[in-house]
Interface confidence: low
């Protein structure tokens, strides 16, 4: 009764030419131990012979006797529950379907596992949180759908091509549920990181470059402002004119409103980037700054201390 066979393994495994593939696999045949195991590549059922045709990668003698050139294939399982496989090195033409032909005393089963082998190391994938705000700690994740005991790799983080100082935590999974390598980096971005390029680089054990993924950081931040005043020393006599200019050096998202404050209080009807004070009086002395807001919040410039002296 074929319904008795239960298998658990990743549906598809990914690797590249010259690397290796480790296939975690468990099974159960309720009528007892396995008597025969054959690993096929791209098996096809032959109705005339009632057998499967295809390249035999492995057969169930003790030390995995296979055609000489296929000694790179290892069955690491047993007769009753483990069907783990290793192919090292793995080649481009191994891509396709692996067929695990299992026979017990009274039952037969063909289990299929997909193998996707690329010509070159495929890139990892950087995952970012949906929104990044300045000064708020975020976790950057770099995920690679690959892990194999015989082929150590490392994932390195770069910011504008320079290795990031923060310590990354790398984890691997080689389970029947999933096979991957993941690097997680905790990072508190500043507004100046907006638009910068973050790279996750896949390297071999010796640090040799294999592939990478890049993302441009989108760091949400309040407007960053510069205030300029004429005269530059902000010391004037009564009756003189003063001009203050507010420049937005960065805003993400775009700014929406502009206002000016004197001694922390908003100046009415001053909603442009230039504040013109004509014929100033002594009581206009004080601390001036501009405030520009966006969806994140308000940003304020440094304060300028205007000193109005008696004429």
């Amino acid at each position: 009764d074929s319904s008795k066979w239960v298998f658990e393994h990743p549906e598809t495994l990914y690797a590249w030419e010259g690397a290796c593939v480790w296939i975690p696999c468990t099974y159960r045949a309720l009528d007892g131990d396995l008597e025969s195991f054959i690993l096929f590549h791209n098996p096809e059922y032959n109705k005339n012979t009632s057998k499967f045709d295809g390249t035999r990668l492995y057969e169930s003698t003790k030390d995995g006797k296979v055609p000489s050139e296929q000694k790179r294939v290892q069955f690491l399982g047993d007769k009753n529950k483990n069907c783990t496989l290793s192919i090292h090195p793995v080649h481009l033409n191994d891509s396709g379907q692996l067929g695990l032909r299992m026979e017990s005393k009274t039952e037969k089963w063909m289990e299929r596992i997909h193998l996707n082998v690329s010509e070159r190391p495929f890139p990892p994938h950087i995952q970012l949180p949906p929104e990044i705000q300045e000064s708020q700690e975020v976790t950057l994740t770099c995920l690679l759908n690959f892990s194999c005991y015989g082929y150590p790799i490392q994932l390195q983080w770069l910011l504008e091509g320079v290795p990031m100082r923060q310590a990354a935590v790398t984890s691997t999974s080689l389970t029947i549920k999933s096979v991957f390598t993941r690097s997680e980096l905790k990072f508190s971005p500043q507004w100046s990181h907006h638009g910068k390029i973050v790279t996750c680089q896949l390297q071999d054990a010796d640090g040799k470059f294999l592939s990478n993924d890049t993302v441009q950081l989108n760091v949400k931040h309040t407007p960053k402002l510069e205030i300029k005043v004429t005269p530059s020393d902000a010391i004037v006599r009564e009756g003189d004119s003063v001009t203050m200019t507010c420049e937005v050096s960065s805003s993400n998202p775009e700014y929406t409103t502009v206002s000016w404050l004197k001694d922390g209080t908003s100046l009415k009807k001053q909603n442009t980037f230039t504040l013109n004070l004509r014929e100033v009086t002594k009581d206009q002395s004080g601390k001036y700054c501009c405030q520009v807001s966006n969806d994140v919040g308000p940003g304020r410039s440094e304060e300028v201390f205007l000193q109005v002296q008696y004429a």
Epitope: T61, D63, K65, D78
Partner: antibody, heavy 120, light 112 residues
Framework: EVQLVESGGGLVQPGGSLRLSCAAS????????MNWVRQAPGKGLEWVGR????????NYSGKFKGRFTISADTSKNTAYLQMNSLRAEDTAVYYC?????????????WGQGTLVTVSS | DIQMTQSPSSLSASVGDRVTITCRSS???????????LEWYQQKPGKAPKLLIY???NRFSGVPSRFSGSGSGTDFTLTISSLQPEDFATYYC?????????FGQGTKVEIK
């Protein structure tokens, strides 16, 4: 029924050669290791070597490398043990034994043995 | 080469006795795949050996339950729980984990 039948034993002079045969039947010959094991009169068992008929791959015990050669003919379902430069101490019953054809390594089927006597 | 040393070399016992034969390997015989390929064979005069136990403790099909195997690493044991008349024979341990494969020198079980 799985069967192994050895033949080719007999009396041979020191320095001479002999080829033993092991005819297999009842299973897929090319897909199981075939081993040769010998037993000197009144002594214990000694593993000589083995062959995988499917591709001719062989392994030998070091003491027999060079003098003994194991081969197989899949069209005849027969394994062979070619013995050269024979010495008196090679006098023994020679058995062929099949690997149990699973990853639980064992000799599950043995031939009846063939006696080789090296004497002048 | 791995030496397999059996003890005793011979023993005398009566029908119904419990018999224990030990086999010690000169080094670990754990195969690279994690299994220990240690077998026990029985041989009667003029006959080919017969497999009793494989992989330390697994009884081969048709072998009576009075035969059992145990052990790990380098020390292994064959036990006959209640000796029967047909059990008088020579017993060999064998390691099939590392080349060259090797047999023990044998233990002859005789009638007391």
């Amino acid at each position: 029924e799985v069967q192994l039948v050895e033949s080719g034993g007999g009396l041979v002079q020191p320095g001479g050669s002999l080829r033993l045969s092991c005819a297999a039947s009842g299973y897929e010959f090319s897909r199981s290791w075939m081993n040769w094991v010998r037993q000197a009169p009144g002594k214990g068992l000694e593993w000589v070597g083995r062959i995988y008929p499917g591709d001719g791959d062989t392994n030998y015990s070091g003491k027999f490398k060079g003098r003994f050669t194991i081969s197989a003919d899949t069209s005849k379902n027969t394994a062979y043990l070619q013995m050269n430069s024979l010495r008196a101490e090679d006098t023994a019953v020679y058995y062929c034994a099949r690997d149990g054809s699973s990853w639980d390594w064992y000799f599950d089927v043995w031939g009846q043995g063939t006696l080789v006597t090296v004497s002048s | 080469d791995i030496q397999m040393t059996q003890s005793p070399s011979s023993l005398s016992a009566s029908v119904g006795d419990r018999v224990t034969i030990t086999c010690r390997s000169s080094q670990s015989i754990v195969h690279s795949n994690g299994n220990t390929f240690l077998e026990w064979y029985q041989q009667k005069p003029g006959k080919a050996p017969k497999l009793l136990i494989y992989k330390v403790s697994n009884r081969f099909s048709g072998v009576p339950s009075r035969f059992s195997g145990s052990g790990s690493g380098t020390d292994f044991t064959l036990t006959i729980s209640s000796l029967q008349p047909e059990d008088f024979a020579t017993y060999y341990c064998f390691q099939g984990s590392q080349f060259p494969y090797t047999f023990g020198q044998g233990t002859k079980v005789e009638i007391k």
